[in-house]
Interface confidence: low
């Protein structure tokens, strides 16, 4: 019969014949022959292969380096790599999460719209009229101005996006 020029899924062509690929979590030890199956071996501890493959070496699990602010989010298996994330207060510099940077703080006049996660930075928004923020924070939202009326007081000093209103007593009308 004619030697094959293409093989089925999960097979590969070698020496004019189709051999089975090694399953995820295993590496290739020796190709199949006319008489023997492909020989595969499981990856060692701290190693993985995540596809059907003909690799002769497994990949090392990613190291989540605490010196770069990283910690393990999900431990690797023989079929999956370790997933790193950042310590609280930090976020990944890339999708691969190879290092971490400090979460941004929202300046006075801005509040936190969305608190940062392990993979995304703080999202800030300007405090709208009626709200203020007088701190630089990675957590604080804009606060509403104090309602002087509900305290039977009057506004003595208008609020801004960075300061609360100042309330004071109502002027008493003389009899």
């Amino acid at each position: 019969p004619e030697p094959p020029t293409a093989c089925r899924e999960k097979q590969y062509l070698i020496n004019s014949q189709c051999c089975s690929l090694c399953q995820p979590g295993q590496k290739l030890v020796s190709d199949c022959t006319e008489f023997t199956e492909t020989e595969c071996l499981p990856c060692g501890e701290s190693e993985f292969l995540d596809t059907w493959n003909r690799e002769t070496h497994c990949h090392q699990h990613k190291y989540c380096d605490p010196n770069l602010g990283l910690r393990v989010q999900q431990k690797g298996t023989s079929e999956t790599d370790t997933i790193c994330t950042c310590e609280e207060g930090w976020h990944c510099t890339s999708e691969a999460c190879e290092s971490c940077v400090l979460h941004r703080s929202c300046s006075p006049g801005f509040g936190v719209k969305q608190i940062a996660t392990g993979v995304s930075d703080t999202i800030c928004e300007p405090c709208p009229v009626g709200f203020f923020s007088n701190v630089s924070s990675a957590f604080e939202k804009c606060h509403p101005w104090t309602s002087c009326e509900t305290k039977d007081l009057v506004v003595q000093q208008a609020g801004t996006n960075k300061t609360d209103v100042v309330c004071g007593p109502q002027d008493r009308l003389r009899a």
């Epitope: 010196n67 770069l68 602010g69 310590e87 207060g89 930090w90 290092s99 971490c100 940077v101 400090l102 979460h103 703080s105 701190v135 630089s136 924070s137 990675a138």
Partner: nanobody
């Protein structure tokens, strides 16, 4: 020109306290995270602590956590390190550094001349 000038080191008994200061000049202090690093005799540089731009977030090496407190006063362009419950292994030259990579302990482009802390009975 960027300058960082540490002070406050000295000889202290185990269990004692010291407060280090670092006066910064030549750059906009509040725009930078700042850090303390130290070098024990015959050893390499060891990261100690980092503080965010406005002092709202602080980080510490496990070896000093609960004993050291980093703080800053942006109005005075000064960084501080309060060191309590000092141990012999805290003996080192302490440097303050301008943390330019915005990483917890990921590099610095300027540091001072250092102040020596000796913990001994």
């Amino acid at each position: 020109e960027v300058q960082l000038l540490e002070s406050g080191g000295g000889l202290v008994q185990p269990g004692g306290s010291l407060r280090l200061s670092c006066a910064a000049s030549g750059f906009t202090f509040s725009h930078y995270m700042m850090m303390w690093v130290r070098q024990a005799p015959g050893k390499g540089l060891e990261w100690v602590s980092t503080i965010s731009h406005f002092g709202d977030i602080t980080y510490y090496a496990d070896s000093v956590k609960g004993r050291f407190t980093i703080s800053r006063d942006n109005s005075k362009n000064t960084l501080y390190l309060q060191m309590n419950s000092l141990r012999a292994e805290d003996t080192a030259v302490y440097y303050c550094a301008k943390n330019d990579m915005v990483m917890k302990n990921g590099g610095f482009d300027y540091w001072g001349q250092g102040t020596l802390v000796t913990v001994s009975s």
